[in-house]
């Protein structure tokens, strides 16, 4: 008799999740020296540890501290660049400009990004069927929470001036509840950073606005503010443009505005 | 290729003031982090502030509350306003630029100027 299963409104883990975790950590590994010492097999076994056979509507950060154990690494604290809603154009920039890093350029963040995963209470088994929705079903499951706990650490680590690239395509340009609002913006330590800088990357073509003018900008500065950190705001008038200037800023095409 | 030239260096009497600018010619220098460095007799050269390209102000931590920098994109200048001078502030200063990101490592600064005295002496 098939055993009854949670249906849940999300997607399923991600299918091959077990090997595609594996695969990405050997490869990161060889990749970076100074985590050439990880064990990847430990790695794999401490993250399924987090969330098999636990009910994935009540996983917490604790669950998940074996992995950031072992997944533990220094990124220089200055050269941190954030996101919210534009991950492409952030990761295209970090691949060009090498001495900057996303979340997803660090051990624990690569061995994650773009995957579902969750299991079920009482079993060893992976759900590949379904998985909580954030929002549908519920906050404290094992995609979400380990986000949570990985963008926390980030920007507890983050120094100097901190660099958040944001969407000046959505309605909300900072929004509240995205991970860099609820999560990232209020774990910068002030002690530590002395400045947050945005950059507002237009997606129209001839969009001239000052998009660090909008409203949820200027919520963003008094978050920020009360803090006790600085702001600043540039706009990215032409995003193709400014990672063609990263690559080479002396082409002629990188003598005006970007 | 950035050209860089600093001024405004002179003798000046502690807790006394002084303004550093830095005129920069060759490429578009809104798109260009400046910083200030400095290098005092037998020491190191070290980071004394950064503006990126955002306008992020970045100091180093003896500076701070006593320095401002600042940048007029419209002159293609960088200005450091000196105030409550020490005689431990005596030093060649100079002005550097590296594209957008202010950062407190000079290595990473790719244009220099060729530094302007500071001397702080009664």
């Known amino acids: 008799v098939p055993r009854w299963r949670q249906q849940w409104s999300g997607p399923g883990t991600t299918k091959r999740f077990p090997e595609t975790v594996l695969a990405r950590c050997v490869k990161y590994t060889e990749i970076h020296p100074e985590m050439r010492h990880v064990d990847c097999q430990s790695v794999w076994d401490a993250f399924k540890g987090a969330f098999i056979s636990k009910h994935p509507c009540n996983i917490t950060e604790e669950d998940y501290q074996p992995l950031m154990k072992l997944g533990t690494q220094t990124v220089p604290c200055n050269k941190i660049l954030l996101w919210s809603r534009i991950k492409d154009l952030a990761h295209q920039f970090t691949q060009v400009q090498r001495d900057m890093f996303t979340l997803e350029d660090t051990l624990l963040g690569y061995l994650a990004d773009d995957l579902t995963w969750c299991g079920e209470f009482n079993t060893s088994k992976i759900n590949y069927q379904s998985c909580p929705d954030w929002r549908k079903d519920c906050s404290n499951n094992p995609v979400s929470v380990f986000w949570k706990t990985v963008s926390r650490r980030f920007a507890e680590a983050a120094c100097d001036v901190v660099h958040v690239m944001l969407n000046g395509s959505r309605s909300k340009i900072f929004d509240k509840n995205s991970t860099f609002g609820s999560v990232e913006v209020h774990n910068l330590q002030p002690e530590k950073v002395q400045t947050l800088e945005a950059w507002v990357i237009h997606g129209g073509r001839e969009d001239s606005r000052d998009l660090c003018q909008d409203p949820t900008i200027k919520e963003l500065e008094s978050i920020i503010s009360k803090r006790n950190i600085q702001f600043s705001c540039k706009n990215i008038y032409r995003p193709d443009k400014f990672l063609q200037c990263v690559k080479n800023p002396e082409d002629s095409s990188c003598t005006s505005e970007i | 290729q950035v050209k860089l030239q600093e001024s405004g260096g002179r003798l000046v009497q502690p807790g006394g003031s002084l303004r550093l600018s830095c005129a920069a010619s060759?490429?578009?220098?809104?798109?260009?982090?400046m910083a200030w460095f400095r290098q005092g007799p037998g020491k190191e050269r070290e980071f004394v502030a950064a503006?990126?390209?955002?306008?992020?102000?970045l100091y180093a931590d003896f500076v701070k509350g006593r320095f401002t920098i600042s940048r007029d994109n419209a002159k293609n200048t960088v200005y450091l306003q000196m105030n409550s001078l020490k005689p431990e502030d005596t030093a060649v200063y100079y002005c550097?630029?590296?594209?957008?990101?202010?950062?407190?490592?000079?290595?990473?600064?790719?244009?220099w100027g060729q530094g302007t005295q500071v001397t702080v002496s009664s």
């Open positions: 550097a630029a590296r594209w957008w990101i202010a950062v407190r490592a000079p290595a990473e600064y790719n244009y």
């Open positions: 503006i990126s390209a955002a306008d992020s102000t």
């Open positions: 060759g490429r578009t220098f809104s798109n260009y982090a």
